[in-house]
């Protein structure tokens, strides 16, 4: 899917009103140092892009972060505001459904949405340049 | 020009009932979402009611849940809120807003639908006072 239509102030908004506090109450307990920031993204776009993958695309050592609330939320902000989103995500969804299994908080897991915090903090200043 | 007009505000008795309209203008207004805000004195903007007029889908806050009831006329445009049981925790200035991508996505709505920050238009207000 390409980003590029999305509306971005909105889902900048959702993010800052609800899914950053779900991704804080996920990682409560967690030093805020202990994860070095190993993905980075260059624009809005491209930030979308990567927060989608982290967030819906199983890793090893981590199967499934898609079930988590900051997950739901995520997937229905791209829904209301990138124009035609829903209807890629519709093979995509089916085939989780398959493979879904419980959910498991992993050293894993928690490294991954450390990363999504800084995607989401970068997309959020779209205007900085790249360190 | 975008505008959204609030009415049917005033002064009513604990337990009483109100109805507050939303006249809209300027937008299509069938593929909207309209919610109702309250702000009380020294409070922030709380949501109160949804209403997707796209396909009628409506939330509610907690607070007013079985009390208020969200409605819309789409032939005239207009959103409406009826308050009953009202009590003095009711008191505020209420507000219509209206964003154009909640409308026809309420299932997903559910999460976002009463951060005001998301909203693109705004009413100016109309005042409830419940007071014996």
């Known amino acids: 899917y390409d980003f590029t239509n999305c509306d971005f102030e909105k889902i900048k908004a959702a993010y800052l009103s609800t899914i950053s506090k779900d991704l804080i109450t996920y990682m409560s307990g967690t030093k805020s140092t202990e994860f070095n920031n190993t993905v980075s993204c260059s624009n809005r776009p491209h930030c979308l892009t990567e927060i989608q993958s982290l967030t819906f695309n199983p890793t090893a050592g981590c199967a499934s972060l898609a079930k988590e609330m900051f997950a739901m939320k995520t997937k229905a902000a791209l829904a209301i505001w990138c124009p035609g989103y829903s209807e890629t995500q519709i093979n995509a969804t089916q085939a989780m459904k398959k493979r879904r299994k419980r959910k498991v908080t992993t050293n894993k897991c928690l490294e991954q949405v450390s990363q999504l915090q800084g995607l989401w903090r970068r997309f959020n200043r779209p205007l900085l340049k790249q360190q | 020009e975008v505008q959204l007009l609030e009415s049917g505000g005033g002064l009513v008795q604990p337990g009483g009932s109100l109805r507050l309209s939303c006249a809209a203008s300027?937008?299509?207004?069938?593929?909207?979402?309209i919610t109702w805000f309250r702000q009380a004195p020294g409070k922030g903007r709380e949501g109160v009611a949804y209403?997707?007029?796209?396909?009628?889908?409506?939330y509610y806050a907690d607070s007013v849940k079985g009390r208020f009831t969200i409605s819309s006329d789409n032939s005239k445009n207009t959103v409406y809120l009826q308050m009953n049981s009202l009590r003095a925790e009711d008191t505020a200035v209420y507000y219509c807003?209206?964003?154009?991508?909640?409308?026809?996505?309420?299932?997903?709505?559910?999460?976002?639908?009463?951060?005001?920050?998301?909203?693109?238009?705004w009413g100016q207000g109309t005042l409830v006072t419940v007071s014996s």
């Open positions: 209403i997707s007029n796209f396909d009628g889908m409506t």
């Open positions: 807003a209206a964003e154009g991508r909640m409308g026809t996505h309420s299932r997903d709505s559910v999460y976002f639908w009463a951060f005001s920050a998301l909203y693109d238009y």
């Open positions: 300027g937008f299509t207004f069938g593929d909207y979402a």
